[in-house]
Amino acid sequence: HTAAQDNCTCPTNKMTVCSPDGPGGRCQCRALGSGMAVDCSTLTSKCLLLKARMSAPKNARTLVRPSEHALVDNDGLYDPDCDPEGRFKARQCNQTSVCWCVNSVGVRRTDKGDLSLRCDELVRTHHILIDLRHRPTAGAFNHSDLDAELRRLFRERYRLHPKFVAAVHYEQPTIQIELRQNTSQKAAGDVDIGDAAYYFERDIKGESLFQGRGGLDLRVRGEPLQVERTLIYYLDEIPPKFSMKRLTA
C-alpha cells in the first residue's frame, strides 16, 4: 500500500500533526497548540480547535426569539485553557491576569475579574440556536426539504445524533437551527452540540476543519444555499451572571 504518511492524516481535523509511530504503527495525531492526542474518528473539541487556531500562523413557522439569558460570542478568539479531556476549563485568564468564567462552548458567562475570580463548575450549554440568513434566491426554499437537508448535514458531516437537532425553522431569508443536548442525554461517544455548531460555523465561513474534504456545498433540491450572515446564541443550563451594568448597556 502507499506510504504511511499518505494514510496517516486526521480526516476530522486538519489542524493536527500526525505520524505512524503509535503502538503497532498506529497513526497518531496531535492537535497543534496543545499537542494533545485527538480521536480522528470524531469531531475534535472546540477548545482544542481554538487553541490550535491561536497557535497557527495566522415548529410553528415563527422564528425563535433568543431568551434574555442567551449568550452571543462577542469576545471572539482567545487562547483557551483546556482540561486533559480537551474541554474548556471553567475559568479562563489572559496574560494580564484578567479572568472570566466560560460555559462548555467556551463563551464568557460572567463579568471579567482578576485572579481571585472563582468558577466552581463548567456550566453546560444545553441549547444552541444557529441563526442564518441566506442570500436571495428565485423563491423560498421548501421548508421540509430544507429541514431534511440540514438534519442530514448534521447527521452525516458532523456525526451528531439526529435527536439533538431539535428543530429547523424557516422564514425567508432566515433559517434557524435549534440544537438541544442536556447533560443527562449525552452518552459516551456522542458528539457535543457545541463542537458540531463550531464545525458548522467554520464550514459556513468557508474555513472547513476537515482534512482534504471540499468546502461545504449546501444544496436544497439542487439549489445552492448560500449563507450571508450567521449568529449563534448559546443557552446554558444555569443562567449567566453578568452585572446589571452590562445588561442595561
Epitope: 506510504a3 504511511a4 505520524s19 505512524p20 509511530d21 503502538p23 503497532g24 504503527g25 498506529r26 497513526c27
Partner: antibody
Framework: QVQLVQSGAEVKKPGSSVKVSCKAS????????INWVRQAPGQGLEWMGQ????????HYNQKFQGRATLTADKSTNTAYMELSSLRSEDTAVYYC?????????WGQGTLVTVSS | DIQMTQSPSSLSASVGDRVTITCKAS??????LSWYQQKPGKAPKSLIY???RLVSGVPSRFSGSGSGTDFTLTISSLQPEDFATYYC?????????FGGGTKVEIK
Amino acid sequence: QVQLVQSGAEVKKPGSSVKVSCKASGYRFTDYVINWVRQAPGQGLEWMGQIYPGSDTFHYNQKFQGRATLTADKSTNTAYMELSSLRSEDTAVYYCARFFEGLAYWGQGTLVTVSS
Amino acid sequence: DIQMTQSPSSLSASVGDRVTITCKASQGINNYLSWYQQKPGKAPKSLIYRANRLVSGVPSRFSGSGSGTDFTLTISSLQPEDFATYYCLQYDEFPLTFGGGTKVEIK
C-alpha cells in the same frame, strides 16, 4: 516490494551482547515503525520494542528496558536491535517487522543461541 | 499491561471444516487487534488487522470479528495450507502483547 533482510545466526556466551541488523528495502524507511519480536524455541511471540526512524522515537517492553537498545541508520535503511547481558533464556529467534496500523511485514528471523 | 488470552491452545480439524479461534483482552482495545499465521521455521504472516480488515492477498475464507474485549478469527473452510499456529496481537497501547497462540492440527 517490501523486504526486510536480517543478519545471520549468532552463538553468544552468557553475559555478552548481540546486535541483530534488519535491512529494509522496497519502501521509504522513515515512513514506518520497525518492531522487534522474539520467539524462544517452541514458545509464543514476545514483543520487545518499537522504533520510528522518522523521528527516532522508541518504546520498549519493560522486561527488556536497559538491556535492549533499538537504533536506526537512515543512510543505509537498516534497523538494529542490541541485547546485552545475555543469558541462556535469551536463546530465541529474533524478528524485525515493519508495522503500519497493525499490518506487518516480517524479516526472516535471526536465531541467537546463548550457550557457555 | 493488557493480557491477551487466546483459546483454544490447540485444535484438531479436517479439511473443509469451519474453524473459530478466540482472543480475549483484559481490557477494551478499541478494535486494535491483528491476527497472524505462523508455520514451523517461518516468520509470522499478517492475516487481519483492525480486528476485521483482511490483508491484501489473504484468501477470503479468513475473517475477523469482535469488538471491545472479545475477538474471533474464523476460517470458513479449512484448507491443507491453513494448518499452522495462529496468534492475535493487541496494539491499542504499549507494550504490545500477543495471545499465547492456537495450533491448528490435522485430525
